[in-house]
């Protein structure tokens, strides 16, 4: 199936041009999405092109500026947040990135009633996290690893925690490993629905080994970056959850929430917190060996001013074939009875589906079923449940939004998006207003992305929010590559692939092939989304065929494929890329002497192992910021899939699955190894060890480091990186510059 929807091309072919590398590096063909910042059932905020903050009322059709660009500019604000009582706005400036999600910033509070900034008891700087209460205008913020509370923006702060210490104790914010591998947020505090209570996590990193690397900067001496970072098998952070009454914070102070006994008996993680009501909270815990998760529903005991988590309200989720959940353990979406909930987990056939849980997990009612997967529950109302899945037409790389009518029996299912713009849109997400009165649909492709507003009752489209007209016009004279998504059936395994073909592709000719791989557990590369990126350029201008293959270990096709890699990373992911390459050669249009593979991060690990597979299939390849040994990577991620690097667990495979162990096999390939020296995630150590092993084996290779760059290799490094990789591939494929 050809995914790029046909466009009316100018009949004069010579007005069409190929993509250039400059187009890609300049972001010439980037697209916009529109996510409303919902503030009620029918109102949302949006930052206009000229930087005014505008409030839109869908029902009256009116809009007005609540905050002018002049006010924003007066403090160089790059972000804002309206208090729920609409009296104040926080303005965020001096953004300073830390890790993937975390950053510090300076915050100013603007009083909308008098049009002035709040003076007196100003916020300290820089702040690590700040948020409004869900009702009114209380503020909670984290400064120097401690949590503070303000009843009103102009009030003096109440200090909730006192033990916060850099790299030692983190209150209300996660440490490195929790941020990257467990919470996927910059915060670790949660307001109750009406702002009565504030829950927060405390992470104790005192005993965690530290990764230290040089940051060269511009000074005479480099400085050393120290991060408590637990690698596989190392000591982990110790987590505790506390809840404080924000109305009378000094009365009893923070109260610790008890950990379920079956979890507390050995090393464990806290995985998420969900407020149900102001006096009921749901915590999810996970054993360090991540195949057992416990969901615990806790109630406030007015008489004792404590939180009680009865054993009868503990729900266990266990995997016998792999780890618990997908990438993360799913979170519950509670029903209006404030006790039962909807949750995605594996059904008896090994597909992730929505279940309804009331008394016990054993008595769960399965809501969706089939040989496809439910991916996200967006919203549950009194009569509808909205979710996304890849059910439609059996394409795992699609996402459509469905509505299940749960107010009647049997619940009826309707696909909201399947037939809206079928050629253009096959990959959606959604954003819902309060009570799902309205929602925005954001379509990511395969055609040009489009965002639309819909009535939550009838699903009628109300208006287009963003249709990327400028992008559509800009692409009119561009020869884009053709894209197709198909599958290979190999030994009872389905390998979905995306192939990107040169514009004038001719099956009777031979083309160089580049495999782009990620391949990490629970990832998906073959998706029906729009992209004009580096590989689009390589196909359009340089005449390469590019393929992406989802092999074993990838997501949304059932547990058999997903958990195939459990405790055995680096084996089947590589085998499946190789198998696909052989199938592509059989198709007849691939020049088997010009095949390359490249990947970044996990993809760098897979591409390195594929190059060192000894098959002779690959002429050359690139690894950007690869993992080289699972002993070097984060405990939370690595142990989820590999277990522990101990003799009585899985040390043998930890040792067998390193890139270094295969150094000899790089002798007959051209290898380009790339890494940022300030990579906090996949440490430069990984590439340093590959390089050392190659040198010790006297194997020639090419390398590039990016000084002071992290895992993303951003800014000017990006341009240098893609230019460098382009030269490398063109040389490998004997393409003239």
């Amino acid at each position: 199936i050809v995914l790029r929807p046909p466009r009316v091309h100018n009949s004069e072919e010579n007005t069409m041009r190929a993509l250039t590398l400059k187009d890609i590096l300049n972001g010439t063909f980037s697209y916009k999405t529109f996510f409303p910042n919902w503030i009620s059932g029918q109102e949302y905020l949006h930052q206009s092109a000229d930087n005014n903050i505008v409030l839109y009322n869908i029902e009256t059709g009116q809009s007005y500026t609540i905050l002018s660009n002049r006010t924003m500019k007066s403090v160089n604000a790059s972000n804002y947040g309206l208090s729920p009582d609409r009296q104040f706005v926080y303005l965020e400036s001096d953004y300073s990135k830390l890790w993937r999600y975390s950053y510090t910033a300076t915050y100013y509070i603007y009083d909308l009633s008098n049009g002035e900034f709040v003076r007196g008891n100003e916020l300290p700087r820089p702040i690590q996290y700040l948020c409004w209460s869900p009702v009114g205008s209380k503020l909670a913020y984290v400064y120097q690893n401690n949590i503070y509370l303000k009843q009103r923006p102009g009030d003096p702060p109440f200090q909730i925690t006192f033990n916060g210490r850099e790299n030692k104790i983190f209150n209300g914010i996660p440490d490195w490993v929790y941020e990257e591998e467990m919470l996927a947020t910059k915060y670790a505090l949660w307001w109750s629905p009406n702002g009565k209570f504030l829950a927060y996590a405390e992470f104790n990193d005192t005993d965690i080994p530290v990764i230290a690397y040089s940051y060269y900067g511009d000074e005479q001496y480099p400085r050393t970056i120290n991060i408590p970072y637990p690698k596989a098998g190392a000591k982990n952070p110790f987590v505790r959850i506390f809840i404080i009454d924000t109305t009378y914070p000094a009365y009893v102070g923070p109260q610790e929430v008890p950990v379920p006994a079956m979890i507390a008996s050995s090393d464990y993680y806290f995985s998420w917190l969900t407020w149900v009501t102001d006096e009921r909270v749901c915590l999810q815990w996970l054993k360090r060996v991540q195949n057992v998760s416990v969901l615990s529903i806790c109630d406030f005991r007015e008489d004792w001013q404590t939180w009680d988590c009865p054993k009868t309200q503990e729900h266990i989720e266990e995997s016998r074939t792999g780890w618990a959940g997908g990438f993360f353990v799913s979170t519950p979406v509670f029903s209006y009875d404030a006790i039962s909930y909807y949750k995605i987990f594996s059904d008896k056939d090994g597909y992730k589906h929505i279940h309804y849980i009331k008394d016990t997990v054993e008595n769960a009612i399965q809501i969706t079923s089939g040989k496809w997967e439910a991916i996200n529950i967006f919203r549950v109302t009194q009569d509808s449940l909205f979710y996304s899945s890849n059910e439609f037409e059996d394409y795992p790389g699609r996402r459509n939004i469905y509505r299940i009518s749960i107010g009647s029996y049997p619940p009826s299912k309707k696909c909201v998006t399947c037939h809206l713009r079928k050629e253009r849109c096959q990959y959606y997400t959604a954003s819902f207003s309060d009570y799902a009165k309205y929602y925005a649909l954001v379509c990511y492709g395969p055609g040009i992305p489009i965002s639309t507003l819909h009535d939550g009752r009838t699903d009628q489209e109300i208006k287009i929010l963003e249709e990327n007209k400028e992008l559509e016009n800009a692409l009119k004279n561009i020869q884009l590559p053709k894209e197709e998504i198909k599958k290979l059936e190999v030994d009872e395994i389905t390998l979905w692939y995306k192939m990107i073909l040169p514009p004038q592709f001719d099956r009777s000719k031979k083309y160089p092939l580049l495999i782009q791989v990620y391949g990490g557990p629970c990832s998906q590369s073959v998706r029906s989304v729009f992209a004009v990126n580096w590989i689009s350029y390589l196909a359009s201008k340089e005449g390469m065929v590019i393929a992406l293959v989802d092999g074993r270990g990838t997501a949304f096709q059932g547990d058999k494929l997903l958990y195939a890699v459990y405790r055995k990373l680096g084996v089947y992911e590589v085998e499946d890329q190789i198998t696909a390459v052989r199938k592509f050669i059989e198709m007849g249009f691939i020049d088997e002497k010009r095949i390359a593979i490249w990947g970044w991060s996990y993809g760098g690990y897979v591409s390195s192992l594929a190059l060192a597979s000894g098959t002779g299939l690959f002429k050359c390849g690139i690894a950007v910021a690869p993992v080289s040994s699972w002993e070097y990577y984060a405990s939370v991620y690595t142990e989820r899939f590999m277990g522990l690097p101990t003799k009585d667990d899985n040390l043998e495979h930890y040792k067998n699955s390193t890139v270094m162990a295969r150094a000899e096999y790089f002798r007959n390939v051209d290898y380009l190894l790339i890494h940022g020296t300030a990579d906090d995630n996949v440490h430069f150590q990984n590439s340093a060890q590959i390089a050392k092993a190659l040198v010790n084996a006297q194997v020639d290779f090419q390398a590039m480091w990016y000084s002071d760059q992290n895992h993303g290799l951003s800014g000017l490094s990006t341009n240098h990186l893609y230019t460098h990789m382009t030269h490398f591939l063109k040389q490998c494929f004997s393409l003239s510059d």
């Epitope: 009875d337 006790i339 039962s340 009331k358 008394d359 016990t360 749960i406 009647s408 029996y409 049997p410």
Partner: antibody, heavy 122, light 107 residues
Framework: EVQLLESGGGLVQPGGSLKLSCAAS????????MSWVRQAPGKGLEWIGE????????NYTPSLKDKFIISRDNAKNTLYLQMSKVRSEDTALYYC???????????????WGQGTTVTVSS | ELQMTQSPASLSASVGETVTITCRAS??????LAWYQQKQGKSPQLLVY???TLADGVPSRFSGSGSGTQYSLKINSLQPEDFGSYYC?????????FGGGTKLEIK
């Protein structure tokens, strides 16, 4: 008008078997969860079990699980209770009950039959 | 298995009076509770579900309340047709047990 009509009751010897039926009309039987409830002479109500519309979920009170079987035939709009290994304490008035779907995912017993009497005696 | 304890087992009241029947669950049933009325020689009739929602056609003098493990059924201004037996039943987890019943008699 909703009607549930139980039949099949009577005298049965200890250790014997009996099959009760409940004919439904006046509502969408094939979309309703159905239950059996019994009441011993002069005593209170005892829940026996329930069955969902497509018979994929059947729940029993633990003490009766091994001797009673609930089933249904949606084509005939009929609910069944197969009783086996009966004892004198199974003597009771047996009701079938059906109900409305209540959000979220449970069913109340909104309508009841008039009951059929089972007497276990030698 | 959750036990339902109903009290009182019996009570006498006059027409026009207000009475309250209580039901205690051996564990939290989270408002998944129904109340039934049964008149002599008749089948039970649903009065209340979700602990406090009146079933269709039930007079407003009946009201249900409670949470957690403690629930009650209140009948304001008793009418002659209100006399009979009353049962609570939980719907939290199977088996859906009934309370022992309360016999309401005319004084």
């Amino acid at each position: 008008e909703v009607q549930l009509l139980e039949s099949g009751g009577g005298l049965v010897q200890p250790g014997g078997s009996l099959k009760l039926s409940c004919a439904a009309s006046g509502f969408d039987f094939s979309r309703s969860w159905m239950s059996w409830v019994r009441q011993a002479p002069g005593k209170g109500l005892e829940w026996i079990g329930e069955i969902n519309p497509d018979s994929s979920t059947i729940n029993y009170t633990p003490s009766l699980k091994d001797k009673f079987i609930i089933s249904r035939d949606n084509a005939k709009n009929t609910l069944y209770l197969q009783m086996s290994k009966v004892r004198s304490e199974d003597t009771a008035l047996y009701y079938c009950a059906g109900g409305y779907y209540r959000y979220p995912y449970y069913y109340t017993m909104d309508y009841w039959g008039q009951g059929t009497t089972v007497t276990v005696s030698s | 298995e959750l036990q339902m304890t109903q009290s009182p087992a019996s009570l006498s009241a006059s027409v026009g009076e207000t009475v309250t029947i209580t039901c205690r669950a051996s564990g939290n049933i989270h408002n998944y509770l129904a109340w039934y009325q049964q008149k002599q020689g008749k089948s039970p009739q649903l009065l209340v579900y979700n602990a406090k929602t009146l079933a269709d056609g039930v007079p407003s003098r009946f009201s249900g309340s409670g949470s957690g493990t403690q629930y009650s059924l209140k009948i304001n201004s008793l009418q002659p047709e209100d006399f009979g037996s009353y049962y609570c039943q939980h719907f939290w987890s199977t088996p859906y047990t009934f309370g022992g019943g309360t016999k309401l008699e005319i004084k």
